[in-house]
């Protein structure tokens, strides 16, 4: 009871004067506020709330639910109080069976005691199943039992308030906890893809996928740099307790030009936020660009091999693809992939195989792409290097030596003169005459060279050499000359292959 | 024992907006979910979204989405349901329900609050 | 959505009679499934919650059982203060009701 020091108002009286009270069950309560400012009783338990306006609170046959805290307040707003146990062999525990707590917080288990002379107040599992190791609790016979430091593992656990009376265990009706979680991490935030590509009117849809421990995590699409409030559907679901997911899909149902732009899932909840974006691009049209992975000038030698590739871009996808040599379409020889199996790739390879080209093969190769919107090509100038091949070698009518010889690059016809039985024939003769006989045909063939040397120059016998060659290689033809008198005649000319 | 007490019945208009009220009489409010179910006149039960005002996130159910705002005053233990641009096919009984979010079952229920659109 | 189908919609039973009303879902739902008891004018009352689980103050008369997606509600023997609609839900995605079903008096 309350100590009154004069001069200031000082809190009520309460009859009987004590701290707590035990009254059986039946019996009358009589508690009398003795102030002369009284304003009213407060009846408390398990959060319910009665009022009594008369100085006298009377029950004249009480309850197990009569039990609780009764507090008398005068004018003044002081206040004095008296705990009353109603004692009820059939009722010892008041229970309020709603139970909640959050992770790593106290809660408490709402069972006070109508007899606070029972002993081993505490809690028990349900049919018998032992308590987690590490439950924790503090018992308290006007409040009930609190749970310390609530765990994520405690979630629907079933228990009973327990005690003692009169030598046998009596039981609670059960309480399941129900435990929020904490959040300890931020969302975990994926989109279904990274960027998109569209035409105009094209449908935009892209979901961003929200993984956390409660269904309350925020979470919500943004437009950079706008704040349009953008319309999105959700879908959700619990794979468990503590392991929520949401799908959150944003859609544009006929895209524009000026739509593009870089979209943001944005989600947070109490302990930090996570983001993720996509980037939309939408053209006014499809479109193909080509980009070549070799030179389009392509030289390769004789007999060799060489393969010719690009790569392009494609929106939308390509639908026909070929290559195309002197208007005829390659059937085989050629490849076509795409360049990623990643869903959003544009990008694509074309390769062509030309093996053991001929010199009759060189030219113009054509890679010829198109989709729904647009088509595209892009040529290929192949030049078959071939060694020289002598064509013709003569004596002329007119006592003129003539070679002619064909290759690419185009060849040098060199003369050499031989005296006697030389082998090697070392002194150079200069041409009279040299002509490219081919040079506005075909631009892909082989060039023709002619050059001619006087044959009478040669005043002794012996081995005239016409050599060709070009970067490739080099071919020889010899003509023989022997003097009979005054009269040189040609012996049959014969050619050597000087690789 | 906790109860759930709802505000009275009301009739509107159609294209206005209600706010119905639920209070929450003790308990550890601000960690319950509280839920908003309604139940057009003879038809079956409808759950519309609820909110933990421990959290202040709302979810709702995708055919509502847009129309009703959910919040709780954690002050006043209490919880709000704000449905807009009603029409004559929201007359129902709306109940507010501890419960039905993160896999919890509507364990307690408050009575119903009767909204009538008419014009 | 997860759609919910309840079956019977209606049935007619006498006092003492083992009813039997299934609900199944259109997709797992693991076990978390809950029954509700509603009688005309009141709101809904909670019985089986986790599909099998007897909520505290409901008659043992009344369990569940099923997991996945098919699910039963059982009333032992039929009391008269039974005869009421009741209502499956499931709490995986967005919460869904069965439509009902109704038990009448034979």
């Known amino acids: 009871q309350p100590s009154v020091s004069p001069g200031e108002p000082s809190p009520p009286s309460i009859h009987p004067a004590k701290s707590e009270l035990i009254v059986r069950v039946g019996n009358e309560i009589r508690l009398l506020c003795i102030d002369p400012g009284f304003v009213k009783w407060t009846f408390e338990i398990l959060d319910e709330t009665n009022e009594n306006k008369q100085n006298e609170w009377i029950t004249e046959k009480a309850e197990a639910t009569n039990t609780g805290k009764y507090t008398c307040t005068n004018k003044h707003g002081l206040s004095s109080s008296i705990y009353v146990f109603v004692r009820d062999p059939a009722k010892l525990f008041l229970v309020d069976r709603s139970l909640y707590g959050k992770e790593d917080n106290d809660t408490l288990v709402r069972c006070p005691l109508t007899d606070p002379e029972v002993t081993s107040y505490s809690l028990k599992g349900c049919q018998g199943k032992p308590l987690p190791k590490d439950l924790r609790f503090v018992p308290d016979p006007k409040a009930g039992i609190t749970i310390k430091s609530v765990k994520r593992a405690y979630h629907r656990l079933c228990l009973h308030c327990s005690a003692d009376q009169e030598g046998k265990s009596v039981l609670s009706d059960k309480f399941i906890l129900k435990v929020r979680p904490a959040f300890k991490a931020v969302p975990v935030v994926s989109v279904s893809k990274a960027s998109y590509l569209l035409r105009e009117g094209e449908e935009f849809t892209v979901t961003c996928t929200i993984k956390d421990v409660s269904s309350s995590v925020y979470s919500t699409w943004k437009r950079e740099n706008s704040q349009t409030k953008l319309q999105e559907k959700y879908n959700s679901w619990h794979h468990g307790d503590f392991n929520y997911e949401r799908q959150a899909t944003l859609t544009i149902s006929s895209a524009r030009v000026n739509d593009s732009g870089v979209f943001m899932c944005y989600a947070n909840n109490t302990f930090g936020s996570a983001n993720v974006t996509t980037t939309l691009e939408v053209v006014d049209k499809g479109f193909i660009n080509i980009f070549p992975m070799i030179n389009t000038t392509v030289f390769v030698n004789d007999g060799e091999n060489v393969d010719l590739i690009v790569e392009y871009e494609a929106f939308p996808k390509p639908e026909h693809q070929q290559w195309i040599y002197m208007n005829r379409t390659f059937t085989d020889k050629w490849e076509d992939y795409p360049k990623s199996e990643n869903e959003s790739n544009i990008r694509y390879v074309s390769e062509l195989h030309l093996t053991r080209l001929k010199g009759t093969e060189g030219g113009t190769y054509t890679f010829l792409v198109s989709n729904s919107d647009v088509n595209a090509s892009i040529a290929f100038n192949v030049y078959v290097n071939t060694k020289p091949e002598i064509l013709t070698y003569d004596r002329l009518v007119n006592g003129m030596l003539q070679c002619v010889a064909a290759g690419f690059p185009e060849p040098t016809i060199d003369w050499y003169f031989c005296p006697g039985t030389e082998q090697r024939c070392s002194a150079s003769v200069l041409p009279v005459d040299v002509q490219t006989l081919n040079a506005s045909g075909p631009p892909f063939g082989k060039l023709v060279v002619q050059s001619s040397i006087d044959s009478s120059a040669f005043k002794h016998n012996g081995t005239v050499e016409c050599k060709a060659y070009n970067d490739v290689g080099k071919t020889s033809a010899y003509f023989n000359f022997a003097f009979k008198g005054n009269n040189k005649e040609q012996i049959h000319p014969h050619t050597l292959f000087t690789p | 024992q906790v109860q759930l007490v709802q505000s009275g019945a009301e009739v509107k208009k159609p294209g206005s907006s209600v706010k119905v009220s639920c209070k929450a009489s003790?308990?550890?409010?601000?960690?319950?979910?509280i839920s908003w179910v309604r139940q057009a006149p003879g038809q079956g039960l409808e759950w519309m979204g609820g909110i933990i005002p421990d959290f202040g996130v709302a979810n709702y159910a995708q055919k509502f989405q847009g129309r009703v705002t959910i919040t709780a005053d954690e002050s006043t233990s209490t919880a709000y349901m704000e449905l807009s641009s009603l029409r004559s096919e929201d007359t129902a009984v709306y109940y507010c329900?501890?419960?039905?979010?993160?896999?919890?079952?509507?364990?307690?229920w408050g009575r119903g609050t009767l909204v009538t659109v008419s014009s | 959505d997860i759609q919910m189908t309840q079956s019977p919609s209606s049935l007619s039973a006498s006092v003492g009679d083992r009813v039997t009303i299934t609900c199944r879902a259109s997709?797992?739902?693991?076990?978390?499934l809950n029954w509700y008891q509603q009688k005309p004018g009141k709101a809904p009352k909670l019985l089986i919650y986790a599909a099998s689980s007897l909520q505290s103050g409901v008659p043992s008369r009344f369990s569940g059982s099923g997991s996945g997606t098919d699910f039963t509600l059982t009333i032992s023997s039929l009391q008269p203060e039974d005869f009421a609609t009741y209502y499956c839900?499931?709490?995986?995605?967005?919460?869904?009701f069965g439509g009902g079903t109704k038990v009448e008096i034979k």
């Open positions: 839900q499931q709490g995986v995605s967005d919460i869904t």
């Open positions: 003790g308990g550890t409010f601000r960690i319950y979910a």
């Open positions: 329900a501890r419960g039905g979010l993160d896999t919890d079952e509507f364990d307690l």
């Open positions: 997709q797992s739902i693991n076990s978390y």
